[in-house]
């Protein structure tokens, strides 16, 4: 059966740094998404070989790609506290195929010791509580407004 290998499981990085997320499959894809999980999952990128990638406006100018849709490395640059969250690869095939997820913890430099990644794969259910006296913006509400609706007409 088709599956998506995703790495790393978890990474802790300071504000302004970069992170690589790799999504690998055995091929036969139409394309692949990187999505940020949450109450309302949000597409971050859609990548399809031979097509210009589509990127969420919150990340435009901050994402690079290397490889192909079957073995794609996504680099997110200039990370912000609001980028903290769990990111999962989703392959478009005849059935839905998901990666195990990558928990990205973006910390202020002085709070680097607050939380470190464990070896266990991330659980999409919850992020660690923020340190006392500081608040992480909600990744969902922190995102930029979506593009305005395109005009369409009924036939």
């Amino acid at each position: 059966a088709q599956e998506v290998q995703q790495s790393p499981h978890c990474t802790t990085v300071p504000v302004g740094a970069s992170v690589n997320i790799t999504c690998s499959t055995s091929g036969g894809l139409r394309g692949i998404y990187l999505r940020q999980l949450g109450p309302q999952p949000q597409d971050i990128i859609y990548y399809e070989d031979g097509v210009v990638p589509t990127t969420d406006r919150r990340f435009r100018g901050r994402i690079d790609f290397s490889g192909s849709q079957d073995n794609l490395t996504i680099t997110m640059h200039r990370l912000q506290l609001s980028d903290t969250g769990t990111y999962t690869c989703q392959a478009i095939t005849e059935v839905n195929v998901y990666g195990s997820g990558t928990l990205v913890l973006v910390t202020e430099e002085q709070s680097q010791g607050w939380h470190r990644c464990s070896d266990a794969p991330p659980r999409a259910s919850a992020l660690p509580a923020p340190p006392t006296g500081s608040a992480l913006p909600d990744p969902q509400t922190a995102s930029a407004l979506p593009d305005p609706p395109a005009a369409s007409a009924l036939p």
Epitope: P41, E48, T54, D56, I92, P146, D147, P149, S152
Partner: nanobody, 122 residues
């Protein structure tokens, strides 16, 4: 160019079946929820069934529950409506619709097919 092409309509006897198809091109189909609407002569267009982007959830208008099944194949950029136990009151032009929901990279975009005629008559 963005296009949704509806097909599979026709004349069928009561109790019969049809499978409608909706082929998408020019956009990323998996970024869009897909719906089927229908419009009977002299009536307003009504929502028949909707399926989420990745097929994990679907909803149906009460009168078609248990008879119609909506599905999609994102790898083929195509959506389907399987219609069984058809009744004369199902006679209408059926339109497919693709709408990008919140969370999609294409949020707010909305496309329509040209429609396919379904006639249920003996």
């Amino acid at each position: 160019a963005v296009q949704l092409v509806d097909s599979g309509g026709g004349l069928v006897q009561p109790g019969g079946s049809l499978r409608l198809s909706c082929a998408a091109s020019g956009f990323t189909f998996s970024g869009f929820a897909m719906s089927w609407y229908r419009q009977a002569p002299g009536k307003e267009r009504e929502l028949v069934a909707t399926i989420s982007r990745f097929g994990e959830s679907s909803n149906y208008e009460d009168s078609v529950k248990g008879r119609f099944t909506i599905s999609r194949d994102n790898a083929k950029d195509t959506g389907y409506l399987q219609m069984n136990s058809l009744k004369p009151e199902d006679t209408a032009v059926y339109y497919c619709n693709a709408e990008a929901p919140a969370g999609s990279l294409w949020y707010g975009n909305n496309y329509w097919g040209q429609g396919t005629q379904v006639t249920v008559s003996s």
